[in-house]
């Protein structure tokens, strides 16, 4: 984090949100592909 000025709490929260967003996008893409293939 920025020069130790901040706790690591907010960046940890945001990283977890980013992972969730990425996984949702990947799973959503796979689901769409499966529907399309049917």
């Amino acid at each position: 984090h920025s020069d130790g000025i901040f706790t690591d709490s907010y960046s940890r929260y945001r990283k977890q949100m980013a992972v969730k967003k990425y996984l949702a996008a990947v799973l959503g893409k796979r689901y769409k592909q499966r529907v399309k293939n049917k």
Epitope: H1, T7, S9, Y13, R14, M17, K21
Partner: antibody, heavy 114, light 113 residues
């Protein structure tokens, strides 16, 4: 000294636009740094507006914002911005920026009135 | 929609009193513990007090403490000092994929009895 300084507030007519700035000093902005905006109407509580990642520029907004406000940043200037459009009387408030919702600026007053 | 209910809205207390403020959240806070507390004095910006429900921010006196998880959280001031008369806000962190990332409680004004 570590600080955030907001500027750009003032009197604006209903329907008008305003851009607020939030300049960071005393520390190096990193990838893990988020600039958030919060407002407080006179005599009321705090209301979250949205945040932007200094690193990737990704943004999140409160649902009520509904496209009227846009948050951006300029890494080279260590500065975040809040662009406010279609302003209404109920947008009258002190607007704060807050780094990672931990370090806060002093606030800038926006008054929407004809 | 998020409901972050803070109580009481006003609290009258004396120096030396033990003071407790509560925040109730619906839905549950992200990971059960991502909740912060702030102190605000008139005309000033909020000051960061507590993060992740119970961790004290740098420079915050040990008379302040936080507890709770999931949907119910408390801020306690063990022995109220003259400098503590102010308004206190909780801030919830949520799963941004389903609701707003953040929501503040309505505030609790701690005034002199």
């Amino acid at each position: 000294e570590v600080q955030l300084v907001e500027s750009g507030g003032g009197l604006v007519q209903p329907g008008g636009s305003l851009r607020l700035s939030c300049a960071a000093s005393g520390f190096t902005v990193s990838r893990d740094y988020w600039i958030c905006w919060v407002r407080q109407a006179p005599g009321k509580g705090l209301e979250w507006i949205g945040c932007i990642s200094a690193g990737g520029g990704s943004t999140d907004y409160a649902n009520w914002v509904n496209g009227r406000f846009t948050i951006s940043r300029d890494i080279s200037k260590n500065t975040g911005y809040l662009q406010m459009n279609s302003l209404r009387a109920e947008d009258t408030a002190v607007y704060y920026c807050a780094g990672n919702l931990e370090i806060w600026g002093q606030g800038t007053l926006v008054t929407v009135s004809s | 929609d998020i409901q972050m209910t803070q109580s009481p809205s006003t609290l009258s207390a004396s120096v030396g009193d033990r003071v407790t403020i509560t925040c109730q959240s619906s839905p549950s806070i992200y990971s059960g513990a991502f909740l912060s507390w702030y102190q605000q004095k008139p005309g000033k910006a909020p000051k960061f007090l507590i993060y992740e429900a119970s961790k004290l921010a740098s420079g915050v006196p040990s008379r302040f403490s936080g507890s709770g998880s999931g949907t119910e959280f408390t801020l306690t001031i063990s022995s109220l000092q003259p400098d503590d008369f102010a308004t206190y806000y909780c801030l919830g962190f949520y799963d941004c994929s389903s609701v707003d990332c953040h929501a503040f409680g309505g505030g609790t004004k701690v005034e002199i009895k």
